[in-house]
């Protein structure tokens, strides 16, 4: 009856049709499962835990970028429940490679100990 319902659809026994799973709002993530024709009885949305964010819809909350610990960069904008953190310039003692393609996380800062001579962030 419902084998053709989509990834984010459940089968509504009242209408005989697939129906969109209720999407979550920004700062929320789905609790339990809904999709491909089925929906858990207690399916709903719950707020993102601390240090995580979500744009809403059906995505789970993701951890904020760790600007200082992972990227060795300053925090330009701290993340909240609805938005990821934004990283700023490198921390003191670190530099960013010029013309280096961004990886999936953005730009990564490297230790001045490994820098070529006269790298501007590392001079002085």
């Amino acid at each position: 009856e419902y084998s053709n319902c989509g990834e984010n659809e459940y089968y509504n026994q009242t209408t005989g049709l697939c129906q969109e799973c209720p999407p979550c709002g920004p700062g929320e993530e789905p609790y339990l499962s809904c999709g491909y024709g089925t929906k858990d009885e207690d399916y709903g949305c719950v707020p993102c835990p601390a240090e995580k964010f979500s744009k809403g819809g059906y995505q789970i909350c993701r951890r904020h970028k760790d600007c200082e610990g992972f990227f060795r960069a300053t925090v330009l904008t701290p993340g909240d429940m609805e938005n990821d953190a934004e990283c700023g310039p490198c921390l003191p003692g670190y530099y960013m490679l010029e013309n280096r393609p961004r990886n999936i996380y953005g730009m990564v800062c490297y230790s001045c100990l490994l820098a070529p001579p006269n790298t501007k962030e590392c001079v002085g």
């Epitope: 009856e1 026994q13 209408t15 697939c18």
Partner: antibody, heavy 121, light 112 residues
Amino acid sequence: EVQLQQSGPELVKPGASVKMSCKASGYSFTGYNMHWVKQSHGKSLEWIGYIDPYNGATSKNQKFKGKATLTVDKSSTTAYIQLNSLTSEDSAVYYCARYYYGDYHWYFDVWGAGTTVTVSS
Amino acid sequence: DVVMTQTPLSLPVSLGDQASISCRSSQSLVHSNGNTYLHWYLQQPGQSPKLLIYKVSNRFSGVPDRFSGSGSGTDFTLKISRVEAEDLGVYFCSQHTHVPPTFGAGTKLELK
């Protein structure tokens, strides 16, 4: 009297898009799902999908997921279907149909007159 | 998707004749709720389809009693006891037990 009034015929070029309307009257617009059905050149009928005018939620036949966009304007009690990247395969009559689901019945009880779409260069 | 097969595709009749149209589905149309969602629609020339019979055998409001539906599981029949001129057109069976809803290819009822 319950009526579904559809927009007039469309002649469109391949690759273009088209948006058709279905104006509902004589009943509570948000109380019934609105479905869209395709009929190619007097042949059989194909279910495209539906929209719930109450909340705008939609569900579509897998075959039309990249082709059709369904929307509503509650203030004017009008449903819309937009078809994109048109090819000759999209030349057809498109019907809107009201869906009844009281008492576990589930059928199309009122149909619009249809909009003829011709895709030609 | 559930395939609906109608026979015949064309049915020549004389006014006053009995007519019978068959519809077979590729899967059982008995829903888990116990209902069988097999409907019949008539499309008269130049018009949109109109509901005639819902859930196998229930006549929709305003449909004359010369129309009757029967069947179960995967095999269904629409009968017209005495064909009148206004009955001419294309008859479609349709299932709404499974998603997506599907229709038969249609049977054209026409004068001999």
